[in-house]
């Protein structure tokens, strides 16, 4: 991924009135062109010259791609899903060869009725999307199918989908136990063989914002972390303000280095600032400390 370097700057003003300007970073879609002339040495950390400016790789920015961004854009999917592979045995329909052909009228009718039946069974599950028949075989009709579940991405999406899969198991077990043939007849839309119900496999969407954050941070992976705001994950360094992990540099500017975040303290007309958090002020004229 590449980062474009914006022209705008943000001014940090110390309490004494001096300023430090830092670029506002926007990671967006880059323009990729070839390296021109001998400008390639100007762009550090894998960035390249596009004829006008350095195009930087994430997580770098700056005129020469020498600075590290405070936050990296990570985009979790809007929705996450689970797929359950199930097998049920329908006893109220006798298997015929036409059911093998997914484009036959018979298959289409079976698919419609089966879908209607499953929509009734799973009607109380908000994550339920639908069913997809993958195979029909003899016995009366053994139905291999997928139950599809979907939910909005939240940090707890796995729990939500795990709970939904449990409810699916309970509901399909219940219906295949209750809707059974009596005297070779079925009074329900479909009847089942209780012992023919099996959950073959469950696949849940895998999305880990922490992993994505670490990958994009590359050699700074140990210093970037994920924090949530309104259930949305943010990949930030301690230099990003407004988060629990934000580093307070007081009279200074936070800068990332390969050893982590550090504060670069300012010097004003009246004070020198020092200390790990730039909170120790020394007055130039009187040479005394105050905190």
């Amino acid at each position: 991924p590449l980062a474009t370097i914006p022209v705008s700057t943000t001014s940090l003003t110390s309490s004494e009135g001096s300023t430090i300007s830092t670029p506002s970073v926007d990671i967006s879609t880059p323009v990729t062109t070839s390296i021109v002339g001998d400008q390639c040495s100007r762009c550090k950390n894998g960035g390249f010259w596009d004829g006008l400016k350095c195009q930087c790789l994430t997580p770098y920015y700056g005129e020469s791609c020498e600075e590290v961004v405070n936050s990296i854009d990570i985009a979790p999917p809007e929705t996450v899903s689970a797929q359950m592979e199930l097998t049920v045995t329908v006893t109220s329909v006798k298997f015929t060869d036409e059911l093998k052909n997914h484009s036959s009228q018979e298959f289409r009718e079976f698919n419609k009725t089966f879908t209607e039946q499953m929509n009734i069974v799973y009607s109380g599950i908000p994550e339920y999307v639908g069913v997809n028949i993958t195979n029909l075989r003899l016995g009366s009709v053994v139905v291999e199918h997928d139950v599809l579940l979907r939910t909005k991405y939240t940090p707890e999406y796995k729990t939500a989908l795990d709970n939904a899969t449990e409810v699916v198991k309970q509901k399909i077990t219940k219906v295949t136990t209750e809707q059974i043939m009596t005297n070779d007849n079925c009074s329900a839309l479909m009847c089942f063989n209780t012992t023919g119900t099996q959950v073959q496999n469950i696949t849940v969407t895998q999305y880990d914002p922490v992993e994505e954050c670490r990958q994009k941070a590359e050699e700074y992976e140990d210093y970037f972390l994920v924090e949530y705001r309104d259930q949305k994950p943010y990949c930030i360094s301690p230099c990003e303000s407004g988060f629990n992990a934000s580093k307070n540099c007081n009279h200074g500017k936070c800068q990332m280095s390969q050893n982590g975040a550090r504060c670069l303290c300012v010097t004003t007309e009246t004070h020198w600032y020092s200390g790990e958090d730039c909170n120790q002020g020394t007055q130039k004229s009187h040479h005394h400390h105050h905190h």
Partner: nanobody
Framework: EVQLVESGGGLVQPGGSLRLSCAAS????????MAWFRQAPGKEREGVAF???????SYAESVKGRFTISRDNAKNSLYLQMNSLRAEDTAVYYC?????????????????WGQGTMVTVSS
């Protein structure tokens, strides 16, 4: 397009007989399951009888021994012979079809329906 057309309904006295017919077209008649349903005024639709492609039949308890379902695959026709008719048999009778070999009289399992024919049993 599947089409089902019923005929043979009418007014009959208690104890009398009627024979309903259903002419089918638009599908391979010999392969599916055919059924008769009925709906009395103010009541739910109920299954009367069904017949599978191999001639297997099933009847509702209320009509067993009085009604006979049959099919003629050569004529693409379904029949319902109704004997010893009672006042409670008064209803609109519907012919229904499924392309599947069904063993159910649940109306929702049958996708194709005729318009119905009225049977009135009254003295």
């Amino acid at each position: 397009e599947v089409q089902l057309v019923e005929s043979g309904g009418g007014l009959v006295q208690p104890g009398g007989s009627l024979r309903l017919s259903c002419a089918a077209s638009g599908f391979t008649f010999s392969r599916g399951t055919m059924a008769w349903f009925r709906q009395a005024p103010g009541k739910e639709r109920e299954g009367v009888a069904f017949i599978n492609s191999d001639g297997r039949t099933s009847y509702a308890e209320s009509v067993k021994g009085r009604f006979t379902i049959s099919r003629d695959n050569a004529k693409n026709s379904l029949y319902l012979q109704m004997n010893s008719l009672r006042a409670e048999d008064t209803a609109v009778y519907y012919c229904a079809a499924s392309l599947l070999y069904l063993m159910t009289v649940n109306a929702a399992a049958y996708p194709y329906w005729g318009q119905g024919t009225m049977v009135t049993v009254s003295s």
